[in-house]
């Protein structure tokens, strides 16, 4: 089941999935002046079997002015700059996403890709939040959001993260070492069915994640 909405927006923060559940779609969007090749794929789809998942279809962009040149190679560094990048406080070694059954890695960029990626997440997907450069994280609980199915409708849990400017940190005394408080999750789950999957895998993965470089903005 696809999630009906985007993950919640947190001021001065970006989110990223460390791995994408099977069924996730990524639209093949091209930057201005370029378009998908004729009869080209509309999206990439994370799919596969129980032992291996990968992205089906390839996104290819070509100049709007020409008809026969197709591009799908990795961008050169100067082209890469066109993509929205939000660098976090310190880089990390990415989690080995291949070890997550039923998940795909971050799809590599394609040449002349649009600056913003449009993902379609599925129920059970977890995304992780971090403050943008120049802001620091004040945690009141997990800095993550999960797409859940409740009463037949999908919703994202609210990440417990506040991003504050460096100059403002003094107004939050005692928050130097962030801790998750027991009342950190505002939503209390009712007795109705909540369909989620892969929580344990995702949570274990989150434990290894301190900071990362988010290379794309997500819609």
């Amino acid at each position: 089941e696809l999630c009906d909405d985007d993950p919640p927006e947190i001021p001065h923060a970006t989110f990223k999935a460390m791995a994408y559940k099977e069924g996730t779609m990524l639209n093949c969007e091209c930057k201005r002046g370029f378009r998908r090749i004729k009869s080209g794929s509309l999206y990439m789809l994370c799919t596969g079997n129980s032992s291996h998942s990968s992205w089906d279809n390839q996104c290819q962009c070509t100049s709007s002015a020409t008809r026969n040149t197709t591009k799908q190679v990795t961008p050169q560094p100067e082209e890469q700059k066109e993509r929205k990048t939000t660098e976090m406080q310190s880089p990390m070694q990415p989690v080995d996403q291949a070890s997550l059954p039923g998940h795909c890695r971050e799809p590599p960029p394609w040449e002349n890709e649009a600056t913003e990626r449009i993902y379609h997440f599925v129920v059970g997907q977890m995304v992780y939040y971090q403050c943008v450069q120049g802001y620091r994280a004040l945690h009141r609980g997990p800095a993550e959001s999960v797409c859940k199915m409740t009463h037949g409708k999908t919703r994202w849990t609210q990440p417990q993260l506040i991003c504050t400017g460096e100059m403002e940190t003094s107004q939050f005394p005692g928050e130097e070492k962030p801790q998750a408080s027991p009342e950190g999750r505002p939503e209390s789950e009712t007795s109705c069915l909540v369909t989620t999957t892969d929580f344990q895998i995702q949570t274990e993965m989150a434990a290894t994640m301190e900071t990362s470089i988010f290379t794309t903005e997500y819609q």
Epitope: L2, D4, D5, G23, M25, N27, E29, S39, S41, L42, Y43, L45, T47, D56, N57, I118, H120
Partner: antibody
Amino acid sequence: QVQLVQSGAEVKKPGASVKVSCKASGYSFTRYWMHWVRQPPGQCLEWMGAIYPGNSDTSYSQKFEGRVTITADTSASTAYMELSSLRSEDTAVYYCSRDYGYYFDFWGQGTTVTVSS
Amino acid sequence: EIVLTQSPDFQSVTPKEKVTITCRASSSRSYMQWYQQKPDQSPKRLIYDTSKSASGVPSRFSGSGSGTDYTLTINSLEAEDAATYYCHQRSSYTFGCGTKLEIK
């Protein structure tokens, strides 16, 4: 529940245009690609094109490019397919269908378009 | 452009029979989808990713194949399976021309 309800049958003269609508309900209209597929009597299914209502991105089959225009009204959760310069071989049942990624999971009931002088 | 060629075009079969429909792609593909269309109805999804059954599809329907050759198999055919079956390629949105199954 998800439903795609299409407009009624049309009879058109050669050279005219036809605009078929597809009203979606029961899901978030802007987040799924919507496709148009046609089926001439006793013939194959033919993909015509698709639209992503979230940003009005479209893709058309080369066979129909220049003659087909697919649009979406997000406020009405309705997709439209307009085919111009009609000829007799455009007589067909036209379907809208929602793209679930793996497959087209929901289809409209079909709209019969007859082109006859 | 990819062309999907189905065979046979038409098959008349008796209930409980095993039916095999093939679909050949003009170039190698990673996955194939199959749809069922009954008279005066819209197509209905049956098999996706070559061998996965869509929800609610009876277990007698199965798919297999790789590269350019793909197969839809109906084990122990039932009267309600009288329909036209189409293979479909997701990345190019190409459909085969269908195999019509008639129940004797």
